[in-house]
Amino acid sequence: IWELKKDVYVVELDWYPDAPGEMVVLTCDTPEEDGITWTLDQSSEVLGSGKTLTIQVKEFGDAGQYTCHKGGEVLSHSLLLLHKKEDGIWSTDILKDQKEPKNKTFLRCEAKNYSGRFTCWWLTTISTDLTFSVKSSRGSSDPQGVTCGAATLSAERVRGDNKEYEYSVECQEDSACPAAEESLPIEVMVDAVHKLKYENYTSSFFIRDIIKPDPPKNLQLKPLKNSRQVEVSWEYPDTWSTPHSYFSLTFCVQVQGKSKREKKDRVFTDKTSATVICRKNASISVRAQDRYYSSSWSEWASVPCS
Amino acid sequence: RNLPVATPDPGMFPCLHHSQNLLRAVSNMLQKARQTLEFYPCTSEEIDHEDITKDKTSTVEACLPLELTKNESCLNSRETSFITNGSCLASRKTSFMMALCLSSIYEDLKMYQVEFKTMNAKLLMDPKRQIFLDQNMLAVIDELMQALNFNSETVPQKSSLEEPDFYKTKIKLCILLHAFRIRAVTIDRVMSYLNAS
């Protein structure tokens, strides 16, 4: 058993039929010695008396809010949560496996630049009685500070018969240098509590590996005289790290016909312009990627050819 | 300050070109190592990230762009140098700070060159003959060092009398390649910045 926060405790249980469970001793936080009784949740049934209560925790029915009283007055509370371990593996019932970029990916994180700020998000089909708390650091043995805000319900979508809820958190490394070469990864730890079930999820990454620039901005077309060719120009996104001559991007320019089956013409360039042939009803799209470290491409910025 | 993309200074351009070749070569070598050594811990998640140049050179700090000198987190504790102009030592205008930056890059390359050559000698003794260092990568390191044009005594290859542990050598190769790739990215950024300044 360990303390998650004040008066909230997590009992770690091996979860299998007829498992013996864990013996837990609760102590009433009071100077009083006599006349103390214990109850669980809203029930008035007295579970025991005395300053300590010993219970055998085997299942969710044994978890909950234990309260010690004296003469009708509440003295203190202890909330017991269960953390299940099945076949040596901690349960992951609360969050959905996003399977991207690999199986068992519960937390996904992205950064727009090298400023040390990043966003993580996760998915669940649970709509109520759900709380998350997020901690982060750079490195684990001698951790350096990363400050995270509160996890927020940020999107909801219908997936088949189910509603899927997305929660997000924004974090900022306390002292980040955009030019630094990372040798210790960022660690993100999410505590999830659904009713009386506790689970924890972790992710470890380097900012350089989760970079996904915003799409190029101010995408414009300039027709070239007496030609089907156009000059496409664009700019670096506002959110990208500066100076741009140090944090350079590379670009992919694509000409796509109306039909998805039509052949796509693609050009790669380090410049912020390109000359392409504009077909009727086609659109021109441009996306960006760090020129020197191949993390994710941005989403496409698009303009119609007409 | 968003620097305009100017016509490259002919003196600087060789260094930019060589640094791009270097990044390409080390990235290819790392990819090859990851594929060939698939049953070894060779991915970014599996290895310990070590920097053989730590406390010996200060490339990141010495080559910090002027725009980042206002960021206290970039200044660290050591005396930092800022690059402001330059053309790979081909121009008389090359400042002292620039020279410090480029000499730090040169020292990085020299250290990695020694490590890689020593490691290759060990790998050539491996009866499995599983992996060797790409000669192209070694050549590109050499070319960039020559383009940087520092006069420096040749460092002898480290020799080892004990029987090499090939498993450890291959893991060390992965660690070195990951670290060198990160340094090659920094070198490329620096050369691109200098080329535009």
């Epitope: 966003t119 805000g149 997000s168 | -």
Partner: nanobody, 115 residues
Framework: EVQLVESGGGLVQPGGSLRLSCAAS????????MFWVRQPPGKGLEWVST????????RYADSVQGRFTISRDNTKNTLSLQMNSLKPEDTALYYC????????RGQGTQVTVSS
């Protein structure tokens, strides 16, 4: 006292554009996630878009993805929603909110898309 005041609604033809604004006060705007939600005539509240405190990260309901853009200016405590390629089904009362469910929202601004 928390205040959210929306503006910029109006009548627009299908395919047209509108830009909604929300002036926020009485709370720490720059550290709050912000949301746009809407209520079509005769229906319940539905979530439209979300933006993170820094403005780095945004999310959209499938029905508006690619047409609407959420943004914020933390120096002016304002939230915006740029709505392009508007459709009749976008007709609704639009609210700026501090949560996805719209429990903490402003008075709303009416958007009508009709020819």
């Amino acid at each position: 006292e928390v205040q959210l005041v929306e503006s910029g609604g109006g009548l627009v033809q299908p395919g047209g554009s509108l830009r909604l604004s929300c002036a926020a006060s009485g709370f720490s705007f720059s550290s709050s996630w912000m949301f746009w939600v809407r209520q079509p005539p005769g229906k319940g509240l539905e979530w439209v878009s979300t933006i993170s405190p820094s403005g780095d990260y945004s999310r959209y309901a499938d029905s508006v993805q690619g047409r609407f853009t959420i943004s914020r200016d933390n120096t002016k405590n304002t939230l915006s929603l740029q709505m392009n390629s508007l459709k009749p089904e976008d007709t609704a009362l639009y609210y700026c909110a501090r949560d996805l469910r719209g429990t903490m929202r402003g008075q709303g601004t009416q958007v009508t898309v009709s020819s």
